[in-house]
Interface confidence: medium
């Protein structure tokens, strides 16, 4: 099991680091989006894991960005963000659809309404129970 956990972390690390770099290879990214969406978590250790990805990094004062699957819908009141950006992406996640759009990446708003926990613990718990 420990070996499996290590392998899983390796795969997740690579997925995060290469996120969005190859539009032709999105299966791993979509699987990870689905994990974040279902387990209500973001990143491996923490949401900031996503900020190592060049296409997601803002400058010092700009908002960083994360995959929309990191968004906590129950904490988000901004209907514009919900209707135009997050819900379309999450509905695709719900159907495990295979299409990717630029809307898959969302800016972190001032009151960061994203899941604050990384996914590591939840996944490890899931592995232990199966």
């Amino acid at each position: 099991r420990a070996q499996l956990e290590r392998s899983l972390r390796d795969v997740v690390e690579k997925t995060i680091q290469k996120y969005g770099t190859n539009p032709e290879e999105t299966a791993a990214e979509e699987s990870w989006d689905y994990v974040q969406f279902q387990l209500r978590c973001c990143g491996w250790h923490y949401p900031q894991d996503w900020f190592q990805v060049l296409i997601l990094r803002g400058n010092g004062s700009e908002a960083h960005r994360v995959p929309c699957s990191c968004y906590n819908l129950s904490a988000t009141n901004d209907s514009t963000i919900l209707d135009k950006v997050i819900l379309p992406q999450l509905s695709r996640l719900g159907h495990l659809a295979r299409s990717r759009h630029s809307a898959d990446i969302c800016a972190v708003p001032a009151e960061s309404h994203i899941y604050r926990e990384g996914c590591a613990q939840g996944l490890q718990k899931w592995l232990h129970n199966n």
Partner: antibody
Amino acid sequence: EVQLVQSGAEVKKPGESLRISCKGSGYSFTGYNMNWVRQMPGKGLEWMGNIDPYYGGTTYNRKFKGQVTISADKSISTAYLQWSSLKASDTAMYYCARSVGPMDYWGRGTLVTVSS
Amino acid sequence: DIQMTQSPASLSASVGETVTITCRTSENVYSYLAWYQQKQGKSPQLLVSFAKTLAEGVPSRFSGSGSGTQFSLKISSLQPEDSGSYFCQHHSDNPWTFGGGTELEIK
């Protein structure tokens, strides 16, 4: 421009209490964790812990748990590091640092001197 | 806790030379490693994050590499302003820990 402004140097006696502060500006204060790092005279850096200012959740280095309290007031974009009873060994420079994974912006430090 | 072994503890080099500082971790930290520079009497400054991503405004003569347990910071074409202390730090599992530091002197 991102800035972390720390409170001024403090000279205290053993057993006294102290709270030092770090005010963030030029960015979304609640979107980043705030860390505290200790540097004893002539020594290296030690991560003490951090706070998520949005939810108020704290994470401590075991070495410092129970020795200090980290808190934040998001309404004034300020994080705090507090001691209830200082010791001579708490003499050090204390830095606050914002984190996005690594610590990308640092305050100038608050020198705390504890001496009888 | 993850132990960070940084070497050398100090080094001296001339302007224009290339130096490499290494950092070894006691456990796999993947790419969760940062490098900082600290000048005398100043606060640390982030140079490199996630093992190899250069921080904003850092000259391209600095470069980070490595993953897992072995990392290095290379400074090519040394400049007088590069003198100071350099620290590695992992930002993987808590507690985050720093290397002991490398004091760089420019001859």
